[in-house]
């Protein structure tokens, strides 16, 4: 039911694991701790998920309700242009950047911001719910 691509939509699936928030057809995990961008990505991958890839403005607006001024890592990187971890370009929102060394993307309640990938920030994972209730 929910297997397949990490990035596929996931219709009519069971509920999310403990500590993950269900919205629409996906589960979201908002971290308590902080990690650098690569370690945040690793954290998500180990739990059958990926760093948040936002599909449209509607999803972005909803998620921002749960965010504060503090920035969270998402699956967005500047690799010859801003791209999501699923390979798609960032085309529905602007990202503010102060420096060319800020090549990883973060989000807070006000929008998207480029940041140096080594900075420890909170992060957001996203995944499809699974039929069996694993902790992760």
């Amino acid at each position: 039911l929910c297997q397949g691509s990490n990035y596929s939509t996931c219709a009519s699936c069971p509920s999310c694991p403990d500590r993950w928030m269900k919205y629409g057809n996906h589960c979201y995990y908002f971290s308590v701790e902080e990690k650098d961008w690569n370690s945040s990505l690793e954290f998500c991958l180990a739990r059958d998920s990926h760093l948040l890839v936002i599909t449209d403005n509607q999803e972005m607006s909803l998620l921002q309700v749960f965010l504060s001024e503090a920035f969270c890592w998402i699956g967005l990187r500047n690799n010859s242009g801003w791209r999501w971890e699923d390979g798609s370009p960032l085309n529905f929102s602007r990202i503010s950047s102060n420096s060319f060394v800020q090549t990883c993307g973060a989000i807070n309640k006000n929008g998207l911001q480029a940041s140096s990938c080594e900075v420890p920030l909170h992060w957001v994972c996203k995944k499809c719910p699974f039929a069996d209730q694993a902790l992760f």
Partner: antibody, heavy 120, light 107 residues
């Protein structure tokens, strides 16, 4: 209560391999990552990596890639670590550890340690 | 890799002393530092997590503080059972890394 029971001490020849185990009791095995940590006599701690028993996902410290291989056997709630091409540098106590809270990497529970001695 | 430096390998103390053990990260690790105590022949025991939170059952004479790159574990009223090695660990970046340890000894 939560317990991690490790296999006994090993004396092995240089160049050989060794497989040490960590059996989990008192919790749902697939709910908590198993981490492995190395401690050389009188020295600090070195994180080797972890395995997620739920899906087999591993994350290795680059320093131990090719040296350590982490596996799990869900049916017996046991995690194993195989160390290959052993040298005197691999002589150490090896611990398995879990955080018990799967969203943090603070190790609240540790095995008793397995001493591996590499000697001709 | 992030290097965690515990500059004092040994510290001499007396019962009743206030002891501060320091740990310095080679880059910003936020508040993701953990402290462990290890006695000879035993496995490490978790004392402090997230830089300043005492783990369940840890006596309140143990306190942790710091953020960014500088961290301290303080024992406010040193007891003989506190003679041990103390290690810091960062959780901000893989690989997870530990300090080399600080051994508390009696004067």
């Amino acid at each position: 209560q939560v317990q991690l029971q490790q296999s006994g001490a090993e004396l092995v020849r240089p160049g050989a391999s060794v497989k040490i185990s960590c059996k989990a009791f008192g919790y749902t095995f697939t709910n908590h990552f198993i981490n492995w940590v190395k401690q050389r006599p009188g020295q600090g701690l070195d994180w080797i990596g972890y395995i997620n028993p739920y899906n087999g996902y591993t994350n290795y410290n680059q320093k131990f890639k090719g040296k350590a291989t982490l596996t799990v056997d869900k049916s017996s709630s046991t995690a194993c670590m195989e160390l290959s091409s052993l040298t005197s540098e691999d002589s150490a106590v090896y611990y398995c550890a879990i955080s018990y809270d799967g969203y943090y990497e603070r190790f609240a529970y540790w095995g008793q340690g397995t001493l591996v001695t590499v000697s001709a | 890799d992030i290097v965690m430096t515990q500059s004092q390998k040994f510290m001499s103390t007396s019962v009743g002393d206030r002891v501060s053990i320091t740990c310095k990260a080679s880059q910003n690790v936020g508040s993701t530092v953990v402290w462990y105590q290890q006695k000879p022949g035993q496995s490490p025991k978790l004392l402090i997590y997230s830089a300043s939170n005492r783990y369940t059952g840890v006596p309140d004479r143990f306190t942790g503080n710091g953020s960014g790159t500088d961290f301290t574990l303080t024992i406010s009223n040193m007891q003989s059972e506190d003679l041990a090695d103390y290690f810091c660990q960062q959780c901000s970046s893989y690989p997870l890394t530990f300090g080399a340890g600080t051994k508390l000894e009696l004067k």
